[in-house]
């Protein structure tokens, strides 16, 4: 049975040219996390493996930084970065947990962080 929950930074917004931290946290389980994948729609951004550490996809390595923790920092944001981001926790024995974050990149300086929410 999968007892864990993923808490994410939820719906967030940031200014064009700025940076943002995408953060997920797996709680309520002692399952072993073997790997966390960060994906944007169908594109793999980065992988954090328990044994091997971080791997950033070559096409994103200029604008993506690992951390903090299992999170991901996106830099030099463009309007094209607007969209859904997924943190995918591969664990055993539980299996796979997925968290969703929606990022909106704004032209103006009215960007605000949304509320945190949980995905079971």
């Amino acid at each position: 049975m999968m007892t864990g929950t993923i808490e994410t930074t939820g719906n967030i917004s940031a200014e064009k040219g700025g940076s943002i931290i995408l953060q997920c946290h797996l709680s309520s389980t002692t399952a072993q996390v073997t790997q966390v994948n960060w994906e944007q729609q169908d594109q793999l951004l980065a992988i954090c493996n328990a044994d091997l550490g971080w791997h950033i996809s070559p096409s994103f390595k200029d604008r993506v930084a690992p951390g903090p923790g299992l999170g991901l920092t996106l830099q030099s944001l463009t309007v094209n970065d607007t969209g859904e981001y997924f943190c995918i926790y591969h664990t055993y024995p539980d299996g796979t947990y997925t968290g969703r974050i929606f990022l909106e990149v704004l032209e103006s300086s009215v960007a605000e962080h949304g509320a945190r929410f949980q995905i079971p």
């Epitope: 049975m1 999968m2 007892t3 864990g4 946290h25 797996l26 709680s27 309520s28 389980t29 002692t30 399952a31 072993q32 996390v33 328990a50 044994d51 550490g53 923790g69 055993y92 024995p93 539980d94 299996g95």
Partner: antibody, heavy 118, light 112 residues
């Protein structure tokens, strides 16, 4: 090389407390769920506590729930087991263990003996 | 709770001969993910337990190929194709498909 070294065992009176430590090296400690397993003299193995890699989630069987507390300090690569209200039946060798490769106890420490007796 | 029952309790063996240990669970230990998290450990006299087999049939690194695991659902077996003197000790099965995670009572293997 993965190394787990337990310490803190000893003789304690019934009702007393003890804190065990497990010093980890040779791997990224903060990436792993960790466990304590005990073995009473001449008996089998029993899982007594687990803690997630971040320390945010824990698990205890009913036999120790409310008396034992597992914790970790990822900055010191150290796992702890705080044992309160100890009973004679808690007398055992206590091992810390780490998962790996899809196994739950891939690596074990050498164990530390806890004796609860008056 | 899932009860893990091992048999026999004691197994006298002759070096060079095969040996087999059974482990039965009180309910299926196939996890929702489809994996069966059944492991075998050997505890030699005066030592910590050591992992032999994980996920029913996978040998852990450094484990000799004379050890093999098999089974499914509720019925599992550890086989030693040719017992060596160094194989003496207590063998435990363990499941972590379900909480609480549980060990079998152990099977003591000794040389005849």
């Amino acid at each position: 090389e993965v190394q787990l070294v337990e310490s803190g065992g000893g003789l304690v009176q019934p009702g007393g407390s003890l804190r065990l430590s497990c010093a980890a090296s040779g791997f990224t400690f903060s990436s792993y769920t960790m466990s304590w397993v005990r073995q009473a003299p001449g008996k089998g193995l029993e899982l007594v506590a687990e803690i997630s890699s971040s320390g945010g989630s824990t698990y205890y069987p009913d036999t120790v729930k409310g008396r034992f507390t597992i914790s970790r300090d990822n900055s010191k690569n150290t796992l702890y087991l705080q044992m309160n209200s100890l009973r004679a039946e808690d007398t055992a060798v206590y091992y810390c263990a780490r998962p790996g490769l899809g196994a739950w106890f891939a690596y074990w420490g050498q164990g530390t003996l806890v004796t609860v007796s008056s | 709770d899932v009860v893990m029952t091992q048999s026999p309790l004691s197994l006298p063996v002759t070096p060079g001969e095969p040996a087999s240990i059974s482990c039965r669970s009180s309910q299926s230990i196939v996890h929702n993910s489809g994996n069966t998290y059944l492991e075998w450990y050997l505890q030699k006299p005066g030592q910590s337990p050591k992992l032999l087999i994980y996920k029913v049939s996978n040998r852990f690194s450094g484990v000799p190929d004379r050890f093999s695991g098999s089974g499914s659902g509720t019925d599992f077996t550890l086989k030693i194709s040719r017992v060596e003197a160094e194989d003496v000790g207590v063998y435990y099965c363990f499941q972590f498909s379900h909480v609480p995670r549980t060990f079998g009572g152990g099977t003591k293997v000794e040389i005849k």
